[in-house]
């Protein structure tokens, strides 16, 4: 008995599609071996029509595909535009066609039901609108127009020109009779229901001279579109429901085991708490279409999703819907990265953001998720260097470590910084990820002065104290600008044993600016890192003033003031460029700050990492 299993009998009608699901034991070998769909010929040979290795026969070109779901132990063969010629005996299998790992499937494609001659066929999705056209002759122009529904051998009146409306169609049907000279009347049915499916008869006049026209109305419930996304990645549901519902509330819901549909998000402000911080409903276009983005995908997000429109913001029968079946692949290409990053008030966080390594040149962004209404995610920083004004001096996006990961550093943390942030690029939208920043009790590990005033032409020395646990880390100072944080050159004072025996007095890395120039004004960061992986940072603002007193200044943390609140910025305003982002509607236009000037001059700035007992220390 073959371990492969599927449907023995599949039946459909011409023009339709089938989606044949075959199951196999998900062993490591089975998961990765070739999957195929072949047709058994008279000779007994089975000719491949489509395979998981990308082969598609000419007969199936443009209308069939095979998708493997390795973690589920299934593969799906989709065949569209079926014809009677597709009827026959097939096999779905693993490995080589002639070997035994396969399952026999019989496919029968029949003609649609026999319809009276001249029948017009209308195929419409549930919830949409149909317009049935009914021609008539001049002599029947003044006579009664009507639409009947054929149920078995009887005809039930649906609507007529004497203002009768069948209760089943109340408030969603209208009969239109055009002006003189036009020999056609129309019946418009809105918000189609499955029960509207069937054969209709238009009639104008009565007796032997009456005009009749048959209409076959096929109301389809949408076939769910299979969506296959990676764990930790992102999915976008694009929902286009038509102009008829452009001004009606929209929703995305997930079908539960009770066959009801739980609202995930809607335009009335409702949102499922399970999606907090990782969902956005994009504002709709003029045509009523909208999209919903969910990031940080989890296995439990799998299921059937419906989008729709209704004034209540939830599913109601007879309103248009679109459907998706979401599968979440656990064998994800998206690397694990912390979903929660903790920092202390006054301290910092370094967030690692994954991106598709094939898209190293893509623009990188970081945005703050805001839950109000449908959610929005205004950009805070991007790799081209623009930073939102209120984040000046405390936020930077670094391309390091590279090869599929960039880093975002945020310091001077306050409780207001707690929340959800999204990492994204202008490339592969499936790599959008979410991180939550939590502010916890504690003290920052790095201690720097809060506010430093330097004197033009003199020497400035700024200390940065760090705990012993960072003794093996690389220490650095850098000058912040809105294009990044430019590392300042180290002053190598020869080999040092300063950190071998870490004591209370040997935990200092200091920045020296000599002589201080106007260009030195700005934000400086002291930080620790290991290779290309950044740790904590602390920020200090250096203001530069005219010479008042001669001599060198050494600023100790004890004398530090708070960083200035009222720095006058040369701020520019720029709209986020639509072209830079795949779906620009995710983001609001935000004010950003222009570059805050030149970097500190080369040899004038030096970093000294030394023991206060052994002044010969140098730092890496």
């Amino acid at each position: 008995k073959s371990p492969v299993f599927g449907p023995q009998e599949v039946s459909s009608v011409e023009g339709n599609s089938v989606s044949i699901k075959c199951y196999y034991p998900p062993t490591s070998v089975n998961r990765h071996t070739r999957k195929y769909w072949c047709r058994k010929g008279a000779s007994g040979r089975c000719i491949t029509l489509v395979s998981s290795e990308g082969y598609v026969s000419s007969n199936y070109a443009g209308r069939a595909n095979l998708t493997n779901f390795p973690e589920n132990g299934t593969f799906v063969v989709n065949i569209a535009q079926l014809s009677r010629d597709d009827s026959g005996h097939y096999k779905c299998g693993l490995g080589i066609n002639s070997r035994g790992l396969s399952f026999d499937v019989s496919l029968e494609v029949s003609q649609g039901p026999e319809l009276p001659n001249g029948t017009e066929v209308y195929t419409v999705d549930v919830g949409r609108t149909v317009t049935i056209k009914c021609p008539f002759k001049t002599e029947n122009a003044p006579k009664t127009k009507a639409l009947y529904k054929k149920i078995g051998q009887t005809s039930v009146l649906v609507i007529d020109s004497r203002n009768y409306v069948n209760p089943n169609y109340k408030d969603r049907i209208r009969l239109r009779i055009p002006g003189t000279g036009q020999l056609i009347f129309t019946v418009v049915i809105d918000r189609l229901r499955l029960s509207d499916h069937g054969l209709y008869l238009c009639q104008a006049g009565d007796g032997s001279n009456r005009d009749e026209k048959n209409a076959d109305l096929q109301v389809l419930e949408p076939e769910p579109e299979l969506v296959y996304e990676d764990l930790r990645g992102s999915v976008t549901f694009h929902c286009a429901l038509g102009l008829e519902v452009a001004n009606v509330a929209k929703f995305l819901c997930r079908v539960n085991s009770r066959e009801t549909c739980d609202v995930v998000i809607n335009t009335l402000g409702k949102r499922d708490s399970a999606f907090e911080g990782r969902i956005l409903l994009n504002p709709q276009d003029k045509d009523g279409s909208f999209s919903v983005v969910i990031t940080g995908l989890r296995k439990e997000d799998e299921g059937r999703y419906l989008c729709g429109a209704h004034s209540d913001g939830q599913l109601q029968e007879g309103w248009p819907i679109q459907a998706w079946q979401l599968f979440v692949n656990e064998e994800s290409t998206i690397p694990r990265s912390p979903t929660v990053v903790k920092g202390v008030a006054g301290g910092s966080v370094a967030v690692l953001c994954p991106y598709n390594p094939k898209e190293s040149q893509s623009l990188k962004y970081w945005c703050l998720w805001e839950g109000a209404q449908n959610g929005r995610c205004p950009l805070l920083v991007e790799s081209q260097g623009l930073v939102q004004e209120q984040y000046e001096g405390r936020l930077s996006l670094l391309q390091e470590p590279g090869n599929g990961t960039f880093t975002v550093i945020l310091n001077q943390l306050t409780t207001q910084d707690a929340g959800f942030y999204w990492c994204l690029t202008n490339g592969d939208t499936r790599w959008r990820t979410t991180v939550e920043i939590k502010i916890i009790e504690g003290e920052p590990n790095l201690k720097v002065p809060g506010n430093v005033t330097a004197v033009l032409g003199e020497t400035l020395n700024i200390p940065c104290h760090f705990p012993c646990k960072f003794s093996s880390y690389e220490k650095y100072w850098c000058k912040w600008s809105n294009t990044g944080c430019q590392t300042l050159p180290s002053q190598d004072e020869g080999p040092s044993e300063a950190f071998v025996n870490c004591d209370e007095n040997s935990r200092l890395v200091s920045l020296t600016l000599n002589p201080v120039t106007r260009a030195d004004e700005g934000w400086y960061w002291c930080g620790v890192k290991q290779g290309h992986f950044y740790g904590e940072t602390a920020a200090v603002y250096v203001a530069v003033e005219e010479k008042k007193v001669a001599g060198s200044r050494y600023v100790s943390p004890a004398k530090a003031d708070a960083a200035p609140d009222e720095k006058v910025l040369d701020s520019g305003v720029r709209e986020i460029e639509n072209k830079a982002i795949q779906d620009p509607r995710l983001f609001a236009e935000e004010k950003v700050v222009a570059d805050t000037g030149d970097q500190a001059g080369g040899s004038r700035a030096s970093v000294d990492s030394s023991s206060s007992e052994e002044q010969g220390g140098s730092s890496k």
Epitope: F5, P7, Q8, E9, V10, S11, S12, V13, N16, S17, V18, S19, I20, K21, Y23, T74, L220, E221, P222, E223, P224, V255, S257, R258, E259, T260, C261, G303, R304, L306, E317, A323, Q325
Partner: nanobody
């Protein structure tokens, strides 16, 4: 909420026929799957057959031991899934259950189904 009710069970001689029916009430979304299972006294519930549908496409699944003897179908008008059982054998004896789900999971597994009927007893005497 979906309710499933089985009917049509009874006592039949070996070689005879029975027609079971599973009636569904409540809202279903487009594609749907219903499966028939049976449980002999002291044994696990085992797969008999299943039917899935989506639009005008139908998919039928059978356990090897019933293939060619049992036929599963769908009666749209009555919202029922009948199971026609021919050439019955004593080993077909058991309580027959129908299960329903709107997902197309592996129909052979009981875990694939979200709700169940109460069952109907089929006894095949030799």
């Amino acid at each position: 909420e979906v309710q499933l009710v089985e009917s049509g069970g009874g006592l039949v001689q070996a070689g005879g026929s029975l027609r079971l029916s599973c009636a569904a009430s409540g809202r279903t979304f487009g594609s749907y799957s219903m499966g028939w299972f049976r449980q002999a006294p002291g044994k696990e519930r085992e797969f008999v057959g299943a039917i899935s549908w989506s639009g005008s496409s139908t998919y039928k699944y059978y356990e090897d031991s019933v293939k060619g003897r049992f036929t599963i179908s769908r009666d749209n008008a009555k919202n029922t899934v009948p199971l026609q059982m021919n050439s019955l054998k004593p080993e077909d004896t058991g309580v027959y259950f129908c299960g329903g789900t709107m997902e197309r999971r592996d129909p052979r597994r009981t875990s694939a189904y979200d709700y169940w009927g109460q069952g109907t007893l089929v006894t095949v005497s030799s």
